[in-house]
Interface confidence: low
């Protein structure tokens, strides 16, 4: 009652290996690493057969089939390429994930190489079975920002793509009687978050309570160059409007806010985020040069009072920008203390501009980012937000523009963007 000699399957083995197999002897068929036993269209690790009384084996020897990891999962904001010929997805095949450059980069700077493991899963040395994450690249416009700027008073037209983080925020507060409409600027921090000044998003009430405008009343435009032609721009409604809880309407202390967009915006040459600074109380050093852009008043012959009294909020049609030096806190404080009126320059603010005037931000530029190039990281960083100015006309002599010191709020910003209250989990490159 001997059973016939067994031939092990290709890429497999039989245990125990005996010269003779008799009735009731059992053998276990297993496959080499990266192969699985294939029997009746079912895949298993091992398969047992037995020598029967009539000298026949209970089953045929199964085959060993190479493990197949299948088509790799798609990567959000990335792509996958096959390193192995014929786009093989079997054991020891390699694939490489990469992010959509130059707009996204890989978190943790992993190689992005995944190998088909013996377990049938695509595996990376560092991330194991987890997919890599493609994060937005911040503060690196596709067009290099210029070094020199002549004299959004004393500014010049920006070319499309120079300030890809620049957002136009339009607020139409239908809860007011009569309806109130105004605008400001903001800066894109990620696909879903806009940084701006709190006063841009405060409901224009007749008292001093700070109530944010309803999200339904906010529209954000990105990739916009000329306000007369919004066809190429991305417009988005707001999912959330978050004012800094300590924003003070009397002195504009803590003048900072966030808008979470209803839908993430696609990044590209004309829509890219700005970087946040490191959290440090010092803020930008005096004499450092920064750039600020906006669609605010650019006509030095029109006074702010005229604009306010006429009820219109005059825009520059084309995005303007200006280069301004940071002014020491002491000098700025002194310049405002010498004026009549209660002008408080707090530690949450810094000033920029020229003693002789001529270049400045103005009404309508509010909330726009004052950006400084960080030599160490080679990124542009939002160090300030256009906040307020003195009683005189924009660009007046010895009246500096006052900016929210963003570095004081980095922790608050990250908390809000990653809090359980956020509409969805978002990661942003710092």
């Amino acid at each position: 009652n001997e059973c016939p000699k067994l031939q092990p399957p290709v890429y497999g083995k039989i245990e125990p290996s005996q010269a003779v197999y008799s009735f009731k002897d059992q053998v276990l068929v297993s496959c080499d690493t990266g192969y699985k036993v294939l029997k009746d269209n079912g895949v298993m690790d091992t398969f047992q057969i037995e020598c029967l009384k009539d000298g026949a084996w209970s089953n045929k020897i199964p085959t060993c089939k190479i493990v197949d990891c299948g088509a790799p999962a798609g990567l959000k904001h990335g792509l996958v390429t096959f390193s192995t010929r014929n786009n093989l997805t079997t054991y020891k095949s390699e694939i490489r994930y990469s992010c959509q450059q130059p707009y996204y980069k890989m978190l943790h700077n992993t190689t992005g190489v995944y190998t088909c493991s013996a377990h049938g899963t695509w595996t990376n040395e560092v991330l194991k079975r987890s997919l890599p994450t493609c994060l937005p690249v911040c503060g690196q416009p596709s067009r290099a920002l210029p070094n020199l700027v002549k004299r959004i008073i004393g500014g010049r037209n920006a070319e499309l793509g120079l300030f890809p983080w620049q957002a136009l925020i339009v607020v139409e507060d239908t809860s007011r009687v009569p309806n109130d409409k105004w605008f400001g600027s903001g800066a894109l921090l990620s696909e879903s978050w806009i940084l701006t000044a709190a006063h841009v998003l405060r409901s224009q009430r007749r008292d001093n309570t700070v109530i944010p405008v309803s999200k339904e009343h906010v529209t954000v435009y990105l990739g916009l160059h000329d306000v007369r032609d919004k066809s190429g721009a991305v417009n988005s409604s707001a999912a959330r409007v978050i004012l800094h809880p300590d924003f003070n309407i009397q002195n504009y202390n803590h003048d900072i806010a966030l808008v979470q967009l209803q839908k993430p915006v696609p990044l590209g040459a004309h829509v890219m985020p700005i970087c946040l600074p490191r959290p440090e109380p010092e803020g930008p050093a005096p004499h450092m040069l920064g750039l600020v852009a906006g669609w605010g008043i650019s006509n030095p012959n029109v006074t702010v009072d005229e604009i306010i009294l006429s009820g219109t909020r005059t825009l520059s049609d084309v995005l303007q920008y200006v280069k301004l030096p940071v002014v020491s806190h002491a000098e700025c404080k002194a310049s405002y203390e010498s004026r009549s009126g209660n002008y408080s320059v707090t530690e949450n603010m810094f000033c920029a501009g020229y003693y002789e005037g001529g270049k400045d931000t103005c009404l309508g530029d509010s909330g726009g980012a004052f950006v400084i190039f960080d030599e160490m990281s080679q990124h542009w960083v939002a160090q300030g937000l256009v906040s307020w100015g003195g009683p005189e006309e924009c660009g007046s002599k010895q009246v500096y523009g006052v900016y929210t010191k963003v570095s004081n709020y980095v922790d608050w910003l990250w908390e809000e963007m990653n809090s359980p209250r956020a509409v969805r989990d978002l990661q942003v490159e710092r």
């Epitope: 109530i211 922790d411 908390e415 990653n418 359980p420 209250r421 710092r430």
Partner: antibody, heavy 114, light 112 residues
């Protein structure tokens, strides 16, 4: 000053539903979410969920997804919690809290008994 | 879901003694971006509503006596009462707010 005033005790039959209320005063109701917490007699605290009055957005503890429904009425500055298909396991004190748990209601006792 | 484990479940100390209770989370509560631990401590006296004592693991809520100190980071946290007073008789709960909210089982503090 900030106050959260909750509705009075409830004695309900198994299988029935009950609606608890939490009336806020002393702050702008729409600026912060309202949390609801359960505490069975002699037991610990269990987070049920929260609601953001400004846009009615809610988040629930998975355990309470089919048990509780959170709503608000901004005209009366009141948050509500509906509890459905009550069993003896739902007998507990239910608290509401706001302004990041700085302020709490006094609690509402719900007793489920036939 | 994040699981919060408190120990001991109860302890009895004399007035004036120092007491420490611990809270462990099943995953880190430290947000590396904000550099904050999303853990809070609450005190619940008999028949009362809970009261917030500490947030961000170590920041004392305004009006809370300075004998209450929170410490720890990542997954291991503790609440210390430097000199227990009779009015500290209560159950103390930790709560994570890193991902939604979960309370620990509580530590009952009794005064000898």
């Amino acid at each position: 000053q900030v106050q959260l005033k909750q509705s009075g005790p409830e004695l309900v039959k198994p299988g029935a539903s009950v609606k608890l209320s939490c009336k806020a005063s002393g702050y702008t109701f729409t600026t912060d979410d309202i949390n609801w917490v359960k505490q069975r007699p002699g037991q610990g605290l269990e987070w049920i969920g929260w609601i953001y009055p400004r846009d009615d957005r809610t988040k629930y503890n998975d355990k309470f997804k089919d048990k509780a429904t959170l709503t608000v009425d901004t005209s009366s500055n009141t948050a509500y919690m509906d509890l459905h298909s009550l069993t003896s396991e739902d007998s507990a004190v239910y608290f509401c809290s706001s302004l990041e748990d700085t302020y709490w209601g006094q609690g509402t006792l719900v007793a489920v008994s036939s | 879901d994040i699981v919060m484990t408190q120990s001991p479940s109860s302890l009895a100390v004399s007035a004036g003694e120092k007491v420490t209770m611990t809270c462990k989370s099943s995953q880190s509560l430290l947000n590396s971006r904000t550099r904050k631990n999303y853990l809070a401590w609450y005190q619940q006296k008999p028949g009362q509503s809970p009261k917030l004592l500490i947030y961000w693991a170590s920041t004392r809520e305004s009006g809370v006596p300075d004998r209450f100190t929170g410490s720890g980071s990542g997954t291991d946290f503790s609440l210390t009462i430097s000199s227990v007073q009779a009015e500290d008789l209560a159950v103390y709960y930790c709560k994570q707010s890193y991902n939604l909210y979960t309370f620990g089982g509580g530590t009952k503090l009794e005064i000898k």
